[in-house]
């Protein structure tokens, strides 16, 4: 029950996160004009990954797409790529996780298959979230760098008579949406990975127990399994019993807490 809840919650959290990543990627307000030095501007500028916008004194907003690909800064291209990779991985992860949900029955799908799918989707969500967080953080870093660069030469003019206020940009709403969405996707992915452990069927490792027949010193090994805790004979570790040299394979083994008969 707890596993199903964890898996379901992980799916929902990731779904919200990926929806947020998509929203952030499409939003125009990645960077917005800093109004600290010019609070009375009638022309408000803001920019997204795909276009830049200007809201004018009439209330009209004009947006223009970045119609060039080669002319754009490499960092912007990198952010675009990270966000798209995040969305693609997240979308695939969602698709996989739908089929992995314990509450959904698809044919005679085994729990082991569902566990693998849950783990796969979990990893995809984690990478998706990291991509979004990385993309947003790279853009934020770019903004901070440009902000302080433009602050250094804030005012230019002719003899100090005419002031030209250089437009500075600060964090837009999309950055916060992206950070939160990336975090949610990451958390959802971790939850899916945790759920996977609970979904995986316990490995039925039948350990052999040797029984001594009365009057005989022959060890019976039922089922043809080796009576050892290792993965094969250990000829290095020789133990001496009753003056006779026997390999560990020949030594009577007692059921440990990990052995199920």
């Amino acid at each position: 029950m707890a596993v199903t809840a964890c898996q379901g919650l992980g799916f929902v959290v990731s779904l919200i996160g990926i929806a947020g990543i998509i929203a952030a990627t499409c939003m125009d307000q990645w960077s917005t004009q800093d109004l600290y030095n010019n609070p009375v501007t009638a022309v408000f500028n803001y920019q997204g990954l795909w276009r830049s916008c200007v809201r004018e004194s009439s209330g009209f907003t004009e947006c223009r797409g970045y119609f060039t690909l080669l002319g754009l800064p490499a960092m912007l291209q990198a952010v675009r790529a990270l966000m798209i990779v995040g969305i693609v991985l997240g979308a695939i992860g969602l698709l996989v996780s739908i089929f992995a949900l314990k509450c959904i029955r698809i044919g005679s799908m085994e729990d082991s298959a569902k566990a693998n799918m849950t783990l796969t989707s979990g990893i995809m969500f984690i990478v998706s979230g990291l991509c979004a967080i990385a993309g947003v953080s790279v853009f934020a870093n770019m903004l901070v760098t440009n902000f302080w660069m433009s602050t250094a030469n804030m005012y230019t003019g002719m003899g100090g008579m005419v002031q030209t206020v250089q437009t500075r940009y600060t964090f837009g709403a999309a950055l916060f949406v992206g950070w939160v969405a990336g975090g949610l996707t990451l958390i959802g992915g971790v939850m899916m990975c945790i759920a996977c452990r609970g979904l995986a069927p316990e490995e039925t490792n039948y350990k052999a127990v040797s029984y001594h027949a009365s009057g005989h010193s022959v060890a019976y090994k039922p089922g043809g399994f080796k009576a050892s805790t290792g993965f094969g004979s250990n000829t290095k570790n020789k133990k001496i019993y009753d003056g006779g040299a026997r390999t560990e394979d020949e030594v009577q083994s007692y059921p440990s807490k990990h052995d199920y008969v």
């Epitope: 009375v40 009638a42 022309v43 500028n45 200007v54 004194s57 030209t164």
Partner: antibody
């Protein structure tokens, strides 16, 4: 056809208040701010402020902050400007203007303040 | 506040003449976001509201005759009427559309000789 129709002329006593209306038609009323201007012989054209019909947000010229109050009625696509404590200095023609770059103006409302 | 200074305050011309009037702003009206100058020119005839002629310092409003041309950038702007006609006699205002409060110039009155 886009139109901004303003209310008629007003003759007011000093200290009184007046409300001027501006009825918009022919465009999406909530998509553009409604701006108000004052034109007198003394000061040419002066911007009073604007109201965003979508949410009622306003912005005023500091000079008119205590003089003018802008309101809007979305249902009738009408903007209003209330002028209080009128003095002779408030005698002027008041215009409403909207759309991009004030492409459309009302015909103007003459307010005369006289004892 | 941005101060808009228009010159001359009045112009007396004859029909067919070329007319130039200037407008200066105390601050740059250039918006770096879209590289547009937020300066607007209006024409006002007696008893009428102002009429939009030029926006973004040089873009002509639709329906405005092409004899009206706006130019300039930053703080210095010009309105040119290539061949003045009788119906052009009016007061011309420039307006700062870049910063609140929006401000207008005192106007240039165009009169016939």
């Amino acid at each position: 056809e886009i139109q901004l129709q303003q209310s008629g002329p007003e003759l007011m006593k000093p200290g009184a208040s007046v409300r001027i209306s501006c009825k918009a038609s022919g465009y999406s009323f909530t998509s553009y701010y409604m701006h108000w201007m004052k034109q007198s012989h003394v000061k040419s054209l002066e911007w009073i402020g604007y109201i965003d019909p979508f949410n009622g947000n306003t912005r005023y010229n500091q000079k008119f902050k205590d003089k003018a109050t802008l309101t809007v009625d979305k249902s009738s696509t009408t903007a209003y400007m209330h002028l209080s404590s009128l003095t002779s200095e408030d005698s002027a023609v008041y215009f409403c203007a909207s759309l991009r770059f004030f492409a459309y103006w009302g015909q103007g409302t003459l307010v005369t303040v006289s004892a | 506040d941005i101060v808009m200074t228009q010159s001359p305050s009045s112009l007396t011309v004859t029909a067919g003449e070329k007319v130039t009037m200037s407008c200066n702003s105390s601050q740059s009206l250039l918006n770096s976001g879209n590289q547009k100058n937020y300066l607007t020119w209006y024409q006002q005839k007696p008893g009428q509201p102002p009429k939009l002629l030029i926006y973004w310092a040089s873009s002509r409003e639709s329906g405005v005759p092409d004899r009206f041309t706006g130019s300039g950038s930053g703080t210095d702007f010009t309105l040119t009427i290539s061949t003045v006609q009788a119906e052009d006699l009016a007061v011309y205002y420039c307006q700062n559309d870049y910063s609140f409060p929006l401000t207008f110039g005192a106007g240039t009155r165009l009169e016939l000789k």
